[in-house]
Amino acid sequence: KEVVLLDFAAMKGELGWLTHPYGKGWDLMQNIMDDMPIYMYSVCNVVSGDQDNWLRTNWVYREEAERIFIELKFTVRDCNSFPGGASSCKETFNLYYAESDVDYGTNFQKRQFTKIDTIAPDEITVSSDFEARNVKLNVEERMVGPLTRKGFYLAFQDIGACVALLSVRVYYKKCPEMLQSLARFPETIAVAVSDTQPLATVAGTCVDHAVVPYGGEGPLMHCTVDGEWLVPIGQCLCQEGYEKVEDACRACSPGFFKSEASESPCLECPEHTLPSTEGATSCQCEEGYFRAPEDPLSMSCTRPPSAPNYLTAIGMGAKVELRWTAPKDTGGRQDIVYSVTCEQCWPESGECGPCEASVRYSEPPHALTRTSVTVSDLEPHMNYTFAVEARNGVSGLVTSRSFRTASVSINQTEPPKVRLEDRSTTSLSVTWSIPVSQQSRVWKYEVTYRKKGDANSYNVRRTEGFSVTLDDLAPDTTYLVQVQALTQEGQGAGSKVHEFQTLSTEGSANMAV
């Protein structure tokens, strides 16, 4: 942006500049060009010997300018176009300036002026151009600065040329007010900070409803000496609830929202949300629908799932396999998990209590992703109730629970109590007992044994009695032994796995129980 301090051509001859000597030399004249009246200051004393004619502008207020640009449009006649070449004719003139804090009026003193440059034409007006009224217009520009006083004068010294000044324009440059990346940069005077730093760094301010992104750089631009903006750094983003429309931030329309400062546009409110108002940063969930803390605001609101479908409990002696299917209503979420809880009741007393500590699950019973689990180590003559709850990311936001239950009665025997009766270097004699009340239900006992540390092979012996001798064993070797009752319903509860050791060949008669 150019800020014009003086424009002779625009003043249509109304600027009364000072000429020295008065009444000689420079003269204000009017001409017709392109059917329009134009004004010019002209001098053409080319046959009168040495000349020293001065034309001084009116006093020009400097405003904020530090460096001024002087644009001259002028024409110079060819000295050879005059008869005899006009021996004292010149084809240049001199440009001067003087700074002052006050207007000296008609008090003109040459010594106050500093020469800026000798102004020479690129093109001179030869006779044929003059006659044909082809004005050979020259344009020259000079820069002066830094200026420090309140104002200044320009002066033109004629030394014997035939010259006409058609335009004298003095201006300084500003980087114009600008909107860039949602930041407003103020009108800035174009001035070099120093010779090594030709750019002035200017901080911008974010437009209404725009902010500097978190952790980002504030908007900066560089104003060059030529009044041009360069090298934008940083940016502003429309704040939550607002989106970029051209160079402004506009509130999100009703039914739309924007949750954070970003370059993104406002998004339509997702499913199961209430219609938002203008400038919404989020959309509230419909009644009965929720948003998990980790859910993005762009995601539909969801609700807890319904209970699992078709829960079945299949008893297998001391074990139960629980199977179920996914809920009919997932609540609109994929993050469904299941948790299994266990309650046991004593048939005699009707007392009930939690049984998590006494049973064993095939996998941890909370946050199950599969739809089956096996529960073992169930006690005989006990009623068990299993509850399978379906949960998703928003289940924690409501008090109600979605579960299905299944009950099962365990009728199997208690595990046998096993002890080592006798042993030798090659045999182990094992006995066991179970409550008398259960003995009639036992069909046989199954004794499973193997060497400790040998997972690949094991031996099984069945017997109807309460003891067995295991022969052909290796000396000084530890064996793992388990006894399990077999009933009509299937396997009963198994005993603990015991460790028994045969004697060494030179060993003692000590027994390990």
Partner: antibody, heavy 128, light 107 residues
């Protein structure tokens, strides 16, 4: 020395034609704008027509437009004025005049010209 | 067309007198004005161009001034050779009109 010598004047009936000539010497004719200026007996000066150094452009006073034609032959250093459909009010002394931009000490040419050099004139009388 | 009006149309003066003739244009002609001198039976002679510039060979007692619409020709000290008719001419437009003339006679 600049010399301009008009010829071709005389008595002519209304509606008749006449061709005036102006012989130039003592200067470079092809550099000069040339013009015809007339002066009715006992009256003031009236510009009639002009022609540029190379033969154009040409301008005419409203009073003669369409009837008079100005021309020049730079090889012969001669200016002409062909006058047709003459009227009584065309009776006047016709001067040939010249302008050389070299003698016009101004930076920018004026919108038109003035006349630096004049011939002695030739009398044209239109009468029945 | 631009009309040029001279005044007075005639004047009587003595040798050595200072004489001023004025010329008024019907519209502004800047400084595009010439002055001519004409003696009886002779061709006009250029005295001044561009309102104030003296033509080559013209005595310095002649001077011109003015701009816009008001112009004047001054003879600072009238000489016997100066008794003649003086015409102004505008060349601000292609019509190049002359004033009606001012006759300077011996008193």
């Amino acid at each position: 020395e600049v010399q301009l010598l008009e010829s071709g004047g005389g008595l002519v009936q209304p509606g008749g034609s006449l061709r005036l000539s102006c012989a130039a010497s003592g200067f470079t004719f092809s550099h000069y704008m040339m013009a015809w200026v007339r002066q009715a007996p006992g009256k003031g000066l009236e510009w009639v027509s002009r022609i540029g150094p190379s033969g154009g452009p040409t301008h005419y006073a409203d009073s003669v437009k369409g009837r008079f034609t100005i021309s020049r032959d730079n090889s012969k250093n001669t200016l002409y004025l062909q006058m047709n459909s003459l009227r009584a009010e065309d009776t006047a002394v016709y001067y040939c005049a010249g302008y050389d931009s070299g003698y016009d000490y101004v930076a920018v040419a004026g919108p038109a010209e003035y006349f630096q050099h004049w011939g002695q004139g030739t009398l044209v009388t239109v009468s029945s | 067309d631009i009309q040029m009006t001279q005044s007075p149309s005639s004047l009587s003066a003595s040798v050595g007198d200072r004489v001023t003739i004025t010329c008024r244009a019907s519209q502004s002609i800047s400084t595009w004005l010439a002055w001519y001198q004409q003696k009886p039976g002779k061709a006009p002679k250029l005295l001044i161009y561009k309102a104030s510039n003296l033509h080559t060979g013209v005595p310095s007692r002649f001077s011109g001034s003015g701009s816009g619409t008001e112009f004047s020709l001054t003879i600072s000290s009238l000489q016997p050779d100066d008794f003649a008719t003086y015409y102004c001419q505008q060349y601000n437009s292609y019509s190049r009109t002359f004033g009606q003339g001012t006759k300077v006679e011996i008193k």
